[in-house]
Structure formats: structure tokens, C-alpha cells
Interface confidence: low
């Protein structure tokens, strides 16, 4: 601690603040009386050089001027630009044991002088804001550094403030506090910016500018929306601006997009009429303001107003598909489906569905609501029947969509041809076919319908389905397509009153089956065994099953088994062979195949035909 | 449904002052932007000030600007309306109006209260 200094002094030439590159001479003095006692002759001064309190050299052959026992004055050069302090003392050199002595220190300040500050710039926010300007104040000096702000304008108006920056705070702006009125919109200001430190000054170039040029309007607040008799598409968009504003950007958009509505209102006076909306959206609403037509800055954007806009009775037609079944010679259910409408479409929070399921000579009608999207009901089979679905929500209902319900799958002659199903990736199908040959009326629209061919899957799970224009051919099907998962395939085609349809099974991806089938039994009937076996559970099928193989050799047999090949239909659980020999010993066993491979075989049967064999 | 009851009107001396309190009952105040408005006899009804939900944005008339002070405590319930300086063509029926801050126009009105500034 170098605070008092009692034993003498150190002083530095030209200065203790210098330029950059400069050499300075440190001059450390004894005081009168002071030194290493009755032996002056002995008194030796060393210079220490100190960085950020770290010792980093010992100035002894640096020293150009000595008295001895009195005075050292040494020249130091290289020095680095920020502070570094200097500590004097004395050393006793009879006495070996004891450390140097501290005299006294000096911190010298290596630094540049500033440079002239640029890039002003002026800004006050809103009409009773302050002027505030910043500027670029060029390379770091290192020293304490005056940054003065000065506003000069007409009637004599001055004004100036002060900052400084160093090496713990960076002046760059300054607040002039005062307000800039729109009755000096005309008038022209300058502000000049002055730098100071003790190696230099520099002043910018003058910088002009007029009211409208800095003020920069608040943003507009308060923002609110009336809808227009509770109308969805059209709203008068409200807000609060400052008295001077005479231009505004309107900003809007729907909140899940990623393009806004631009719009430019001149003298608005805080409302406009928005023509355009969306019904039943969420929109976000910004606004900024500008006080005139050509110069000056627009303000930022207001704060966002989020609102939902009112709902609109539903436009658009509902996708409506149908299943008939035979309950008895009389009677028949029919059950309607269809697919919600899309939001743009829906307009609104659907309520209901409203059905009508009618007779077309208008004998009977059945009516109903319902919140589902299906419907089912027992009609009779005789008679020409139509349906219709429409939508409503607060506001309204829907144009009804019609379908007429005919037999999908009654005329083999309208039955699409060359249906095929490829897998195209792992969660679509692409179902391609051929027009009916021979179709004595023409095709209206063709239908792709899919199920998962699981067990319960008809009753449990409405069918997905796609209308298809015809003259297309071909349909991808994606909507709750899963991999390895077969999946039965239906092309509609239909007419005016006539439906016929081929079907198919397909899947997105397949692997071979986890088992085979499991055989339940072997019965020996007429001179040939049948074979029954119960199918693969579901979740282990991996895939359309294409053929079960039916494996057979003699019991201890080291020969390759014999196989018998049956193409796979669902509803078919047993199968004949009468290639076997009576009284002979066999073990039989099944596999399943997929169009990836073959599964393990299944459970191993051993049976003796009694038999006759062929 | 919000009810509102102003209170604090009176006769005062032209530069004089009063406070309004508007106090509303029957929903969450802090969702609820309020503003003040007045009607004058034989003129229609225009807004004196109004203040955001939170407080943060407040808009004056040019004609109160400086005199007049809407403010809010959310934590009790009630919007206050601060009028310095009265002039006597400050003597209207004032109105406490509070909205939804999501969208809309005023929804709901408080029945008045006379504020008389004699010269």
C-alpha cells in the first residue's frame, strides 16, 4: 500500500498519461532524512512494474540518472495501452534479511486520443418524449474520456449534456431532456457531439435534422375490434394514437400464418374498415403510426390484439359415403357416413348434422340430428332411396349434400378391371385400375374405399374412403394407412342409380409373419385328410397374407418335406391333401408367406391315415 | 353480466378538483379495460380518458390533457378518474364504461354521475 508516501516521491516526465508508443522517465526521490540509517551511501532504489497487481518486471537496468543514496530516475518505453503501475523502493544492502522498503507509486495511463465521434443519430418517441441521440465514438482510447452533446436551434435554443467513458462504463448516448413540439415542425436543429481526454480532443461534423426527421410516433395502443352485426368477415379495427398522426400500417393475419395483410389508411383517426376476414379465425391485429405522409419514422408495431372473428353459416358440401346390408328378405341398414368439414368451410363450431334418409316417390322419410359423423338405419328394401347430410352451427346450416343409396357391388358389368395396390412408402397405398368393359351406363364418380382387415373391423371402425373424378385411375391412399397392416381395398364405381366394385388387399409394408398357422385338426374323409387350422393372430400377419403352405413328411424321415401351396382367402380354414400313404406315419405343419417372406413353421401335427390312399 | 356505479361527482368551484371512482361488480376487473366518458346537455356523449387492463396505456381528450388522471388499482376493484383544474365546460354527466380487452366496443355502461363546476 503506497497511500502516504512517507519516505519520498515519485515523479514521471512528460506525464503520467501518455500516447501510445511513447517512453517515459519515473524519477523516485528520497526525502529529506529518510533512507537506510547512518549509511546513505547504501541507500539502493529499485523500480517495479506492476500489471493488474501482478509484478512482471524489475526495472533495475533501466535506470539512466543516479544520485546515489538520494535519487533514481529510470526510462521506461513498450508500454501497453491501459493503466500500469509503477512501485519505487528501497533497498537496505547491508542488510540482507530485510525486504525492499515501499517509497512511493505512480500509475501511468497509455492510451489515444479520440477520435472525432460519427454517425449521430437522434430520435424522441412520441410527442412529449425527450431528444435523445447516440453516435459511434471510433476506437477505444483507454483513458477517461468527456463525450459533450450539443443541440443548438432556432430562437437561440441551446442546450448540452455530459457523459465520459472508461474503462468500466461506455458513453454513446446521451438524453438532452427536452421535448421537441410539432409547432417547430419546419424548423431545423444541429447537434455536434465534442470529445475530451487528456491526450486529445475531436469534434463530429455537424449533424441537422428537423422534427419530423427524430420524432418517432409511440405506438398505437388501445387497439380494439367491433364486427359489424356480429358478421365474421367484416370488423371496424379501433385504436388511440397520438394527435399528430396522419398515417397508419395496418397489419393482419390469421394466427397459424406466416404472411400478413398489409394495409395503409391516411387520416384513419384511430378506426378502419377491415372487408376481408376470415370467419371464425384466430387473427392477430398490429398497428403502427406515422406523423406524416412522405418524411419521418413509422413507430413500431402496437402491441398485437389477438381475437377470434364470429362465426358464419358453413359453406360447402360434405363428403357422404354409405354401407347397405341385407338384415333379412325385407330389410336392410343402411349406414351414412361423412367427413367433417375444413375450418374455411365449417365457418363456424358445427353443432349438429341434419340427415334425411328419403323414398324418392316421397312415400317415407326419416329425419334426425345428430352430433356423429354417421348415421344408421333399418329401411326397407324395396324402393329408390336418397340421402342428404348438411352442417349447421350457430349461424346456420349448409347447403344438403345428396347421395343416392344403390346397390355398391349389384352390377358386375360397371366392376372396375385390373385393380391393382403397390406399397409406395411406409403410410401410402397407390391403387391403380381399368374402366368396366362393358358398362351400360356411364361412370359418375369412382370410389377407393379401405378397411384394416382386423377382426371387429367393420363394426368397430368407419370405413375411409376417397371420391375419385372418371377419368383419374388411380388413387394414393394415405388417411390411417399404417405398416404391417393389411388393409382390404375397394374400388366403387358408380352411375346414376348403379354401383359395382372389385376388391383388393394391399399394405404400405410388410414383413414376413411372426408365426404360422396353428392346425386345430386332421380328419380323414373319403380317402383324404383335411387339414384345419385356425389363422394368424392379427398383430402377428405383419402384411397381406399371400399363400399358407401346408408341410408333410413321413415321421423319422431325414428326406425333404412335400408342400402344398393354397392361395390365402380369410373365410377358408380348411384344406384337402390326398397325396399320403395309409398306415404310415406323418407329421404335418403350416407356414404363412408375405411378399417379404415366409413365416416360422407352426405347431407340428402327427397323423396315421387308415385309409385307401390314392 | 357487468354492473358499474360511479360515485365522487358534485358541485365544485371552477379550479377546484374531484376523484371519480368506478367500482364494477360481477366479473374479474383485471381482464376489463375502462374508460370515462361525458355528455354535456344538448351534446353527444365523448370519451374523457380511458386505461388499458394493466394500466400500461392511458389516452386523454385533448381538452383534459394535463388536468385529468385515469388510473387503476386492480387490486381493489376500481378505475379512478382525478380531475384538476375544473372549468365550468367541464360540467357534464360522466360515465364509467368498461370492455372485454379482447375485442369490442364498450360493452357495459354505469349509470352516470353530475359533476357541476360553477364559476
Known amino acids: 500500500n503506497i497511500d502516504v508516501c512517507k519516505l519520498g516521491t515519485v515523479t514521471v516526465q512528460p506525464a503520467p498519461v501518455i500516447p501510445l508508443g511513447s517512453a517515459a522517465n519515473i524519477s523516485c526521490s528520497l526525502n529529506p532524512k529518510q533512507g537506510c540509517s547512518h549509511y546513505p551511501s547504501s541507500n539502493e532504489l529499485i523500480l517495479l512494474k506492476f500489471v493488474n497487481d501482478v509484478l512482471v518486471e524489475n526495472l533495475h537496468g533501466k535506470k539512466v540518472h543516479d544520485h546515489t543514496g538520494h535519487s533514481s530516475t529510470f526510462q521506461v518505453t513498450n508500454l501497453s495501452l491501459g493503466m500500469t503501475l509503477f512501485v519505487c523502493k528501497l533497498n537496505c544492502s547491508n542488510s540482507q534479511k530485510k525486504p525492499p522498503v515501499p517509497v512511493c507509486g505512480v500509475e501511468i495511463s497509455v492510451g489515444v486520443a479520440p477520435e472525432p465521434p460519427q454517425n449521430i443519430s437522434c430520435v424522441q418517441e412520441g410527442e412529449n418524449g425527450t431528444v435523445a441521440c447516440s453516435w459511434n465514438s471510433g476506437k477505444v482510447t483507454y483513458l477517461k474520456t468527456n463525450y459533450t452533446l450539443q443541440l443548438s436551434g432556432p430562437n437561440n435554443l441551446t442546450c448540452q449534456k455530459q457523459c465520459f467513458s472508461d474503462n468500466r462504463q461506455n458513453c454513446n448516448r446521451l438524453d438532452l431532456g427536452i421535448n421537441l413540439s410539432p409547432d417547430l415542425a419546419e424548423s431545423r436543429f444541429i447537434v455536434r457531439v465534442t470529445a475530451i481526454n487528456d491526450l486529445g480532443n475531436s469534434s463530429s461534423l455537424p449533424h441537422t435534422f428537423t422534427f419530423l426527421d427524430i420524432v418517432i410516433p409511440l405506438p398505437p395502443w388501445d387497439i380494439r375490434i367491433n364486427f359489424l352485426n356480429a358478421s365474421g368477415s367484416r370488423g371496424t379495427l379501433q385504436w388511440e394514437d397520438e394527435g399528430q398522426v396522419v398515417l397508419n400500417q395496418l397489419r393482419y393475419q390469421p394466427l397459424n400464418s406466416t404472411s400478413w395483410n398489409m394495409v395503409n389508411a391516411t387520416n384513419a383517426k384511430g378506426k378502419y374498415d377491415l372487408r376481408d376476414l376470415r370467419p371464425f379465425t384466430e387473427y392477430e391485429f398490429q398497428i403502427s403510426s406515422k406523423l406524416h405522409l412522405s418524411g419521418g419514422s413509422w413507430s413500431n408495431w402496437s402491441e398485437s390484439l389477438r381475437t377470434r372473428t364470429p362465426e358464419e353459416e358453413p359453406v360447402g358440401i360434405l363428403d357422404i359415403w354409405y354401407m347397405k346390408q341385407d338384415i333379412d328378405y325385407d330389410r336392410q341398414q343402411i349406414s351414412l357416413f361423412w367427413k367433417s368439414l375444413n375450418p374455411s368451410e365449417a365457418r363456424g363450431k358445427i353443432l349438429h348434422y341434419q340427415v334425411t334418409l328419403q323414398e324418392v316417390t316421397k312415400k317415407t322419410t326419416l329425419q334426425n340430428t345428430t352430433r356423429h359423423t354417421s348415421w344408421t338405419r333399418v329401411i326397407p328394401r324395396t324402393g329408390a332411396w336418397t340421402a342428404s347430410v348438411s352442417a349447421a352451427n350457430s349461424k346456420g346450416a349448409s347447403a344438403p349434400t345428396h347421395i343416392n343409396i344403390v346397390d355398391l357391388c349389384g352390377t358386375g358389368l360397371l366392376a372396375p378391371h385390373q385393380v391393382s395396390a403397390k406399397s409406395e412408402n411406409m403410410d401410402n397405398i397407390l391403387v391403380t385400375w381399368q374402366p368396366p368393359k362393358k358398362a351400360d351406363s356411364a361412370v359418375r364418380e369412382y370410389i377407393v374405399e379401405w378397411r384394416a382387415l382386423q377382426p371387429g373391423s367393420i363394426t368397430k371402425f368407419p370405413p375411409h374412403w376417397l371420391r375419385i373424378p372418371p377419368d383419374n385411375m388411380s388413387a394414393l391412399i394415405s388417411e390411417n394407412i399404417k405398416p404391417y397392416i393389411c388393409y382390404e381395398i375397394r374400388v366403387h364405381a358408380l352411375s346414376e342409380s348403379q354401383g359395382g366394385c372389385s376388391s383388393i388387399r394391399g399394405d404400405s409394408k410388410h414383413k414376413a409373419p411372426v408365426s404360422g398357422p396353428h392346425i386345430t385338426a386332421i380328419t380323414e374323409k373319403k380317402e383324404r385328410l383335411f387339414i384345419s387350422w385356425t389363422h394368424i393372430p392379427f398383430p402377428e400377419q405383419r402384411g397381406c397374407i399371400l399363400h399358407y403352405r401346408i408341410y408333410w413328411k413321413e415321421r423319422d424321415s431325414t428326406a425333404q418335406p412335400e408342400l402344398c401351396e393354397i392361395q390365402y382367402r380369410r373365410s377358408q380354414n380348411s384344406h384337402p391333401i390326398s397325396s399320403l400313404q395309409p398306415r404310415v406315419t406323418y407329421v404335418l405343419w403350416m407356414t404363412a408367406v408375405t411378399a417379404a417372406g415366409e413365416s416360422p413353421q407352426g405347431n407340428e401335427r402327427e397323423f396315421c391315415p387308415q385309409g385307401k390312399a390314392n | 353480466q357487468v354492473q358499474l356505479q360511479e360515485s365522487g361527482g358534485g358541485l365544485v368551484q371552477a379550479g377546484g378538483s374531484l376523484r371519480l371512482s368506478c367500482a364494477p361488480s360481477?366479473?374479474?376487473?383485471?381482464?376489463?379495460?375502462m374508460g370515462w366518458f361525458r355528455q354535456a346537455p344538448g351534446k353527444e356523449r365523448e370519451v374523457v380518458a380511458t386505461?388499458?387492463?394493466?394500466?400500461?396505456?392511458?389516452y386523454y381528450a385533448d381538452s383534459v390533457k394535463g388536468r385529468f388522471t385515469i388510473s387503476r388499482n386492480n387490486a381493489k376493484n376500481t378505475a379512478y378518474l382525478q380531475m384538476n383544474n375544473l372549468r365550468p365546460d367541464d360540467t357534464a354527466v360522466y360515465y364509467c364504461?368498461?370492455?372485454?380487452?379482447?375485442?369490442?366496443?364498450?360493452?357495459?355502461w354505469g349509470q352516470g354521475t353530475q359533476v357541476t363546476v360553477s364559476s
Open positions: 364504461a368498461a370492455r372485454e380487452t379482447d375485442y369490442g366496443a364498450y360493452d357495459y
Open positions: 386505461i388499458s387492463w394493466s394500466g400500461g396505456r392511458t
Open positions: 360481477g366479473r374479474t376487473f383485471s381482464t376489463l379495460a
